[in-house]
């Protein structure tokens, strides 16, 4: 078998047939078949190889593991548990690998895992204990710092009879294991709402990406506890207006940058407070790009250029005067 590659390049290994549980012990830093390994970069790439399982014989040195573009379908409990454990594994990318089921304890025995990317997998069945590993009310803290869950919503016909938002949030909150999470990306998931308790229980967040969802309102969402939050991406949602409570909370976050582009802002009398706030605040990035979508007469008007006289509401007619 060929040795692992030097610092400068990746090399495909020869087929490796001895597993950690087979008759002869594996050579400690052998590269699995169908993978490319760089010991110098502490990186293993098993990319676009139609793998149906996680390779059993990953080299102990692996710090960065790419298993993208495969056909894994299911991650069982202990999918990465090895003897000896993969103690150095810090970054794991499983994006685009046709995962639809991630079981409780799938990432157990990875003591250094800081970055996990499950994006572009149709996760119809994400266990509440996928990240916490146990069903205890308070689990051992997860080492995860970055969790990338962009476009994990399954096709509508494959969704279970439960809230997809609820399933994801349950996994984020189980056992309070993700208290140290700093980056959470949940873009492109068709989220209609954000459960009100989720942000309060992720106090270390620096970066939250909720872009390209279907969020209509942030009325019941509290950002107050997210004192470390540096970026909040809300582009490409269905937001109509931000109300006073939300505006005040965002203004109170010391390091925040908010991204609000491409929302269908409704420029009526309810928008007055937000327009006033936009004119004063420095937290909104590209605020000069925000435009009205409704009502028709206000379409494409720049929010920053509006004044109170522009923002009227049609009077609500008493029932006796309404027409059908």
């Amino acid at each position: 078998s060929s040795p692992t590659s030097s610092a400068s390049s990746f090399s495909s290994s020869a087929p490796f047939l001895a597993s950690a549980v087979s008759a002869q012990p594996p050579l400690p830093d052998q590269c699995p078949a169908l993978c490319e390994c760089s010991e110098a970069a502490r990186t293993v790439k098993c990319v676009n190889r139609n793998l149906t399982e996680v390779p059993t014989d990953l080299p102990a040195y692996v710090r960065n593991l790419f298993l993208t573009g495969n056909q894994l379908a299911v991650l069982p409990a202990g999918a990465f548990a090895r003897r000896p454990p993969l103690a150095e594994l810090a970054a794991l990318n499983l994006s685009g690998s046709r995962l639809d089921e991630v079981r409780a304890g799938a990432f157990e025995h990875l003591p250094s895992l800081r970055q996990l990317d499950l994006s572009h997998n149709p996760l119809a069945d994400l266990s509440p204990f996928a990240f916490s590993g146990s069903n205890a009310s308070v689990s051992a803290p997860s080492p995860l710092v970055e969790l990338i869950l962009n476009h994990i919503v399954p096709p509508e016909d494959e969704r279970q009879n439960r809230s997809f938002e609820g399933m994801v949030v349950a996994a984020l909150l189980a056992g309070r294991a993700l208290q140290g999470l700093r980056r959470l990306e949940l873009a492109s998931n068709h989220f209609l709402y954000l459960p009100r308790d989720v942000l309060a229980q992720l106090p270390s967040l620096r970066h939250l990406d909720l872009s390209n969802n279907s969020l209509v309102s942030l009325t019941y969402v509290s950002f107050r506890n997210l004192t470390h939050l540096e970026s909040l991406h809300l582009e490409d949602n269905a937001l109509k207006v931000l109300h006073n409570g939300t505006l005040a909370e965002l203004q109170g976050l010391p390091h925040i940058r908010v991204f609000l582009d491409n929302n269908p802002w409704v420029c009526d009398c309810h928008m007055a407070d937000m327009v006033t706030w936009l004119k004063e605040t420095e937290v909104v990035q590209g605020k000069d790009r925000l435009t009205c979508a409704y009502p028709e007469k206000m379409r494409n008007r720049v929010l920053l250029e509006l004044n109170s006289a522009d923002l009227d509401c049609d009077p609500i007619l008493p029932p006796s005067l309404q027409t059908s």
């Epitope: 087929p15 490796f16 047939l17 001895a18 597993s19 549980v21 087979s22 699995p32 078949a33 169908l34 993978c35 098993c46 190889r49 139609n50 793998l51 149906t52 399982e53 996680v54 390779p55 059993t56 014989d57 056909q71 379908a73 299911v74 069982p76 409990a77 639809d100 089921e101 079981r103 119809a124 069945d125 494959e158 279970q160």
Partner: antibody, heavy 120, light 111 residues
Framework: EVQLVESGGGVVQPGRSLRLSCAAS????????MHWVRQAPGKGLEWVAY????????YYADTVKGRFTISRDNSKNTLYLQMNSLRAEDTAVYYC?????????????WGQGTTVTVSS | DIVMTQTPLSLSVTPGQPASISCRAS??????????LHWYLQKPGQPPQLLIY???NLESGVPDRFSGSGSGTDFTLKISRVEAEDVGVYYC?????????FGQGTKLEIK
Amino acid sequence: EVQLVESGGGVVQPGRSLRLSCAASGFTFSNFGMHWVRQAPGKGLEWVAYISSGSTSFYYADTVKGRFTISRDNSKNTLYLQMNSLRAEDTAVYYCSRTNSLLRGFFDAWGQGTTVTVSS
Amino acid sequence: DIVMTQTPLSLSVTPGQPASISCRASQSVSSSSYTYLHWYLQKPGQPPQLLIYSASNLESGVPDRFSGSGSGTDFTLKISRVEAEDVGVYYCQHSWEIPLTFGQGTKLEIK
């Protein structure tokens, strides 16, 4: 037509070794995971070992772990089972079987089996 | 390990009559995405053959008098009208985790 043909069975003394082969034809061998399953005389079926299509994953039953090694040569369309330190309880008909994946898969094609007898 | 328990261990059925075999797993072998339970028939002197995969899906070429149902821990294989060629030993098997395990088998005889 999918065909799996096992060979290499025989009578062997305890502690000795044997290598089984399974020749595959009628399908793209390199696209499928493969199993060995055994059946002791008059008994039921027991899963023995699995190897993924590209030899990246290997799994064994506890009863054979450390003694048996599963391997494959996709260029020869052949699956192997190296059996060392054989015991009387390894006596069985050994079947090779095809699957599309380990957990989401099932044994959708079987060979006729080869008989291994471990006896002094 | 997951233990698969089949009942009955043997049954004798008159041709044309229905038959039913039960399989119980010691823990759930279903997720909301997939059911990890499969059925096989081993005819006398032959290797096993796949009948039903994922609890209820009929394998290609298997007569439609065979059907499977169940989820979680309890599963059933039914033969709507037994024929002489159906004799043999029926096995259920899970693929939830390693090790894969089979039921102990149910022997079907013709009266």
